[in-house]
Interface confidence: low
């Protein structure tokens, strides 16, 4: 996926065999190319035109490969394959193609805060993360905890705020929000850190 600041395309490689990455000495490289033009028929670039990045395999039983994609080429198709070297044996994956712009994972929304409106509703507000090149949709999840009830809810909105009605005095509301591209494919951001708001007793 592409980081929210659009600086790095990150490819996570996870083995179906959970212990493979843990028990063997191996090196993982990602070979990639951004062809200038893609014809209607699949274009397989010459071997020498691929660039290679070393993948860091010390994270969460998977490997992280960082591919620098120029902003101007985010809409282009990235061709890539994995090369795994272990004990003198080389494994190579099939060729894969992705459009980085369709795999943007935004940073979590910022500035999550809550306040009571004049008409007694809870207004949850946040800011869009910076540098995202398109509008986002947001998923808001919140739980209400009072002496009488525990209520949980999950909403999808395109605005940067959400009104919650029927709020109870003396209740606490724990809220998180995450974002994803509104008008096309994309990846949900991580959830923002939960925030808690306590309504005042009557």
């Amino acid at each position: 996926w592409l980081k929210g600041d659009l600086k790095l395309f990150i490819c996570y490689v996870e083995s179906l065999f959970k212990n493979l990455f843990r028990n063997y000495n191996y090196k993982v490289h990602l070979l990639y190319v951004l062809p200038e033009v893609l014809e209607d028929s699949p274009l397989v670039p010459q071997k020498g035109s691929f660039q290679m990045v070393h993948c860091n395999c010390s994270v969460h039983e998977c490997c992280e490969c960082l591919v620098p994609v120029p902003t101007a080429k985010l809409n282009d198709t990235l061709l890539m394959c994995l090369k795994i070297t272990s004990g003198g044996v080389i494994f190579q994956s099939p060729l894969m193609s992705v459009q980085p712009i369709n795999m943007v994972k935004p940073d979590p929304p910022l500035g999550l805060h809550m306040e009571i409106t004049d008409d007694g509703n809870l207004k949850i507000s946040w800011s869009s993360p910076p540098l995202v090149p398109f509008p986002l949709q947001y998923q808001v999840k919140y739980s209400e905890n009072s002496t009488t009830v525990i209520r949980e809810a999950d909403k999808i909105v395109s605005a940067t705020s959400l009104l919650v009605d029927s709020i109870l005095p003396g209740s606490s509301y724990e809220v998180q929000v995450r974002g994803k591209r509104l008008d096309g494919p994309g990846i949900w951001s991580d959830w923002s850190t939960p925030r808690v708001f306590t309504t005042q007793d009557v």
């Epitope: 805060h113 925030r195 708001f197």
Partner: antibody
Framework: QVQLVESGGSVVQPGRSLRLSCAAS????????MYWVRQTPGKGLEWVAV????????YYIDSVKGRFTISRDTSTNTLYLQMSSLRADDSALYYC????????????WGRGTLVTVSS | DIQMTQSPSSLSASVGDRVTITCRAS??????LNWYQQKPGKAPKLLIY???SLQSGVPSRFSGSGSGTDFTLTISSLQPEDFATYYC??????????FGQGTRLEIK
């Protein structure tokens, strides 16, 4: 220049009233949550009241509820704290402070105005 | 309300010393903790926000760490201008925003 300047502090008798002012300059006053924070040698730093950016949301620490009122005048970029039924334990240095929404820290403080409640 | 407890309440140290101040929250506040420095007659000044992010213009000898309930402010090599009172502040739950009771750092 981005700054906050408090005024209105003085020595008053218990039970009397006082109005503190905080003049803001160099930023759009109405887009921030503004706090009054007080400081005493005994209690350290303690929030007193907050006025959220929409101007209608106001919250108070329990000990001042019903006695203090926070308000603002966006035409003059001024925050107020109307204090009534003052008690000796309200004596403190009162700061006006601006809240940064992204991480909820105070990124701008005034220099404070001193309130002393004494007979 | 979330209670913030700082320790020690006062501390004597010398120029060049490494100093650590701790702050404990009464419940988990993730990384929503800020640190301020206050000198006599002055308003508090933000040093660290979000537990470990250094505020612009603050010397790199100041650092913050921690998550959940336990947090630390470290001054790697004390300078004469660092003698002051330090406060932590939780920004996880509002209202209220709450501060620690302060740690006074004095010259030994």
């Amino acid at each position: 220049q981005v700054q906050l300047v408090e005024s209105g502090g003085s020595v008053v008798q218990p039970g009397r009233s006082l109005r503190l002012s905080c003049a803001a300059s160099g930023f759009t006053f109405s887009t921030y949550a503004m706090y009054w924070v007080r400081q005493t040698p005994g209690k350290g730093l303690e929030w007193v009241a907050v006025l959220y950016s929409d101007g209608s949301n106001k919250y108070y620490i329990d000990s001042v509820k019903g006695r203090f009122t926070i308000s603002r005048d966006t035409s003059t970029n001024t925050l107020y704290l109307q204090m009534s039924s003052l008690r000796a334990d309200d004596s403190a240095l009162y700061y006006c402070a601006r809240l940064n929404w992204d991480y909820w820290y105070f990124d701008l403080w005034g220099r404070g105005t001193l309130v002393t409640v004494s007979s | 309300d979330i209670q913030m407890t700082q320790s020690p309440s006062s501390l004597s140290a010398s120029v060049g010393d490494r100093v650590t101040i701790t702050c404990r929250a009464s419940q988990s506040i993730s990384s929503y903790l800020n640190w301020y420095q206050q000198k006599p007659g002055k308003a508090p000044k933000l040093l660290i926000y979000a537990a470990s992010s250094l505020q612009s213009g603050v010397p790199s000898r100041f650092s913050g760490s921690g998550s959940g309930t336990d947090f630390t402010l470290t001054i790697s090599s004390l300078q004469p201008e660092d003698f002051a009172t330090y406060y932590c502040q939780q920004s996880y739950s509002t209202p209220p925003i709450t501060f620690g009771q302060g740690t006074r750092l004095e010259i030994k």
